[in-house]
């Protein structure tokens, strides 16, 4: 029961986190104009990963997309990449975790397979959350660097003519959404990994039965008909109780899912 709860809660927390990562990635307010020097501006600037916007006090808002790839700063491209990788991994993780949920029965899927899938989705959520946190942190660092550079320019007269008030940018709402969402996804992933341990079947008598029984032992094997259908496991290459309960095939193929992260 506790395992089901942990798994279910991990799924829900990750779902909320990934929704937040998607929202943060799409939001325009990654950086907002710092109003410290000009709190009575009639024009308010803010920028996202995909476009920059200007809101006039009249109520009119104009947004312009960044219609160039090569002209954009490498850091911005990196942040975009991190957020997209986070979303993709999170989405795949969600898909995998749906089938891994203990409360959902799909055919006669073994607990070991569910444990495998739970662990896989958990790791995906963890990496997804880390990608989001990394992306947001890189952007925040970029903002802090630019903020102090423009502040230095302001007070040393480097900003061109004397009358020019340089526009400085500070943290936008999307950064906080991204940090929280990344954290939630990470927590959800950890919960899924914890749930995975509880899902893996413990040493039970039926294992011994499957080895000591006569030729008709197939009837006692967990998974029933699957043994002869090619769907399920072949006992000679299945390590049923190997930690996370992965097949050898899965153990080999698993890292390749993350080769391009």
């Amino acid at each position: 029961m506790a395992v089901t709860a942990c798994q279910g809660l991990g799924f829900v927390v990750s779902l909320i986190g990934i929704a937040g990562i998607i929202a943060a990635t799409c939001m325009d307010q990654w950086s907002t104009q710092d109003l410290y020097n000009n709190p009575v501006t009639a024009v308010f600037n803010y920028q996202g990963l995909w476009r920059s916007c200007v809101r006039e006090s009249s109520g009119f808002t104009e947004c312009r997309g960044y219609f160039t790839l090569l002209g954009l700063p490498a850091m911005l491209q990196a942040v975009r990449a991190l957020m997209i990788v986070g979303i993709v991994l999170g989405a795949i993780g969600l898909l995998v975790s749906i089938f891994a949920l203990k409360c959902i029965r799909i055919g006669s899927m073994e607990d070991s397979a569910k444990a495998n899938m739970t662990l896989t989705s958990g790791i995906m959520f963890i990496v997804s959350g880390l990608c989001a946190i990394a992306g947001v942190s890189v952007f925040a660092n970029m903002l802090v660097t630019n903020f102090w550079m423009s502040t230095a320019n302001m007070y040393t007269g480097m900003g061109g003519m004397v009358q020019t008030v340089q526009t400085r940018y500070t943290f936008g709402a999307a950064l906080f959404v991204g940090w929280v969402a990344g954290g939630l996804t990470l927590i959800g992933g950890v919960m899924m990994c914890i749930a995975c341990r509880g899902l893996a079947p413990e040493e039970t008598n039926y294992k011994a039965v499957s080895y000591h029984a006569s030729g008709h032992s197939v009837a006692y094997k967990p998974g029933g008909f699957k043994a002869s259908t090619g769907f399920g496991s072949n006992t000679k290459n299945k390590k049923i109780y190997d930690g996370g309960a992965r097949t050898e095939d899965e153990v080999q193929s698993y890292p390749s899912k993350h080769d391009y992260v």
């Epitope: 009575v40 501006t41 024009v43 006039e56 009249s58 109520g59 003519m161 008030v165």
Partner: antibody
Framework: EVQLVESGGGLVQPGGSLRLSCAAS????????MHWVRQAPGKGLEWVAY????????YYADTVKGRFTLSRDNPKNSLYLQMNSLRAEDTAVYYC????????????WGQGTTVTVSS | DVVLTQSPDSLAVSLGERATINCKSS????????????LTWYQQKPGQTPKLLIY???TRKSGVPDRFSGSGSGTDFTLTISSLQAEDVAVYYC?????????FGGGTKVEIK
């Protein structure tokens, strides 16, 4: 058709008070910021105050700060300017205008209401 | 506060001739975010309310004759009437719409010579 109609002007003694109103029609009043601009006889335009669509931001010219209070009633499509401690230099035609256009430009103006401060 | 200085105070131009009005700002009105200058030009004919001519320093409002044009960036702006018509006799004002208070220039009176 956008219409702005000012009212409430008149003759008042120095130190007195007056409340100007601006009735708006022909546009979604609650979506736009509103301004008051005045023009003293034979003089140029002087911006007086601004209120944002939801009354979240209100700004005043230094010459009227602390004496004038700007407010709006969106359900009634009305804008108000409460003028206290009036001085002779506040004598002017008061226009209400809206930043209905791009670039914070004041596109629509009322016909104005005259305020005369004199003893 | 942004101070706008208009010059000249008055201008007499022959019909069909070019009229040029200058507006100088004490601070830059250029917004980096959208690369636009937040300066507006108005026309006020005798006994009438002001009328919007140009916003964003150079964008003509729809319905305004194309003989009116705005130019300039940062702190120096110009309103040009390429061929003065009798109906253009008015006072012209520039306005800072970049930061509050939204100050006006002193106005330039355009007359026919």
């Amino acid at each position: 058709e956008v219409q702005l109609v000012e009212s409430g002007g008149g003759l008042v003694q120095p130190g007195g008070s007056l409340r100007l109103s601006c009735a708006a029609s022909g546009f979604t009043f609650s979506s736009f910021g509103m301004h008051w601009v005045r023009q003293a006889p034979g003089k140029g335009l002087e911006w007086v105050a601004y209120i944002s669509s939801g009354s979240g931001s209100i700004y005043y010219a230094d010459t009227v700060k602390g004496r004038f209070t700007l407010s709006r009633d969106n359900p009634k499509n009305s804008l108000y300017l409460q003028m206290n401690s009036l001085r002779a230099e506040d004598t002017a035609v008061y226009y209400c205008a809206t930043s209905y256009y791009y670039g914070n430009a004041l596109e629509y103006w009322g016909q104005g209401t005259t305020v005369t401060v004199s003893s | 506060d942004v101070v706008l200085t208009q010059s000249p105070d008055s201008l007499a131009v022959s019909l069909g001739e070019r009229a040029t009005i200058n507006c100088k700002s004490s601070q830059s009105l250029f917004n980096v975010g959208n690369q636009k200058n937040y300066l507006t030009w108005y026309q006020q004919k005798p006994g009438q309310t002001p009328k919007l001519l140009i916003y964003w320093a150079s964008t003509r409002k729809s319905g305004v004759p194309d003989r009116f044009s705005g130019s300039g960036s940062g702190t120096d702006f110009t309103l040009t009437i390429s061929s003065l018509q009798a109906e253009d006799v008015a006072v012209y004002y520039c306005q800072n719409v970049y930061s509050y208070p939204l100050t006006f220039g002193g106005g330039t009176k355009v007359e026919i010579k």
